[in-house]
């Protein structure tokens, strides 16, 4: 499923994302874009034979199981395909466990390079939330 | 508290070899990222080598290409800095550093090689590395 961007502010505010962790919900929204373009079923297969898996592009090396990732830490126990459905529950969970790790949204390097510092808001003004 | 501990430095005649070790301890999960880094006198550190801990993925400066290689032993969280061919140029203090963010996509850590380290968030003390001619 490819998300609008209002339609996916709302879901992601109906799971809990907006200022969890002191993350506002413009920041989750820009993270979507800019890993995924709002697509659920976004895969990148990485040059360490690992896999980044939907709307937020979660990777199999440290995060969930494709069954294909050699050494693979699965640290939100789910497998991958998961990671695909229209339904973003999966996602959002393993989000909220990346978040918490220590350092924040800086775990997603388009965060860091596209929204980090920017205005976030813009990404949800407009929405009916 | 995460600590990084580097061993092997010394001197060496110009065309010798020495390897380097990097211990982390103190890390739950991860590091994600080690790499050296290396300041000569009145220069800028600069990056050399950096590797995924997890996928094994190297990288290196141009200077070093062909000459150094960086290796994982994942079990014992260190990383190892094989240096031959040693050139009088190579003489510096030696660092390295772990970036201990768990991304949530692939990140490829020689990003931070071209940076002098930009993402890297600990450090070990420096060990100096003497080559002459």
């Known amino acids: 499923k490819v998300f609008g961007r209002c339609e996916l502010a709302a879901a992601m505010k109906r799971h809990g994302l907006d200022n969890y962790r002191g993350y506002s919900l413009g920041n989750w929204v820009c993270a979507a874009k800019f890993e995924s373009n709002f697509n659920t079923q976004a895969t990148n297969r990485n040059t360490d034979g690992s896999t980044d898996y939907g709307i937020l592009q979660i990777n199999s090396r440290w995060w969930c199981n494709d069954g294909r990732t050699p050494g693979s830490r699965n640290l939100c126990n789910i497998p991958c395909s998961a990671l695909l459905s229209s339904d973003i529950t999966a996602s959002v969970n393993c989000a909220k466990k990346i978040v918490s790790d220590g350092n924040g949204m800086n775990a997603w390097v388009a965060w860091r390079n596209r929204c980090k510092g920017t205005d976030v808001q813009a990404w949800i003004r407009g929405c009916r939330l | 508290d995460v600590q990084l501990q580097a061993s092997g430095g010394g001197s060496v005649q110009a065309g010798g070899s020495l390897r380097l070790s990097c211990a982390a301890s103190?890390?739950?999960?991860?590091?994600?990222?080690m790499g050296w880094f290396r300041q000569a006198p009145g220069k800028e550190r600069e990056g050399v080598a950096a590797?995924?801990?997890?996928?094994?993925?190297?990288y290196y400066a141009d200077s070093v290409k062909g000459r150094f290689t960086i290796s994982q032993d994942n079990a014992k969280n260190t990383v190892y800095l094989l240096m031959n061919s040693l050139e009088p140029e190579d003489t510096a203090i030696y660092y390295c550093?772990?970036?201990?963010?768990?991304?949530?996509?692939?990140?490829?850590?020689?990003?931070?090689?071209?940076?002098?380290?930009?993402?890297?968030?600990?450090w070990g003390q420096g060990t100096q590395v003497t080559v002459s001619s």
């Open positions: 550093a772990a970036d201990s963010t768990i991304y949530a996509s692939y990140y490829e850590c020689g990003h931070g090689l071209s940076t002098g380290g930009y993402g890297y968030d600990s």
């Open positions: 590797i995924n801990m997890g996928g094994g993925i190297t």
């Open positions: 103190g890390y739950t999960i991860g590091p994600y990222c």
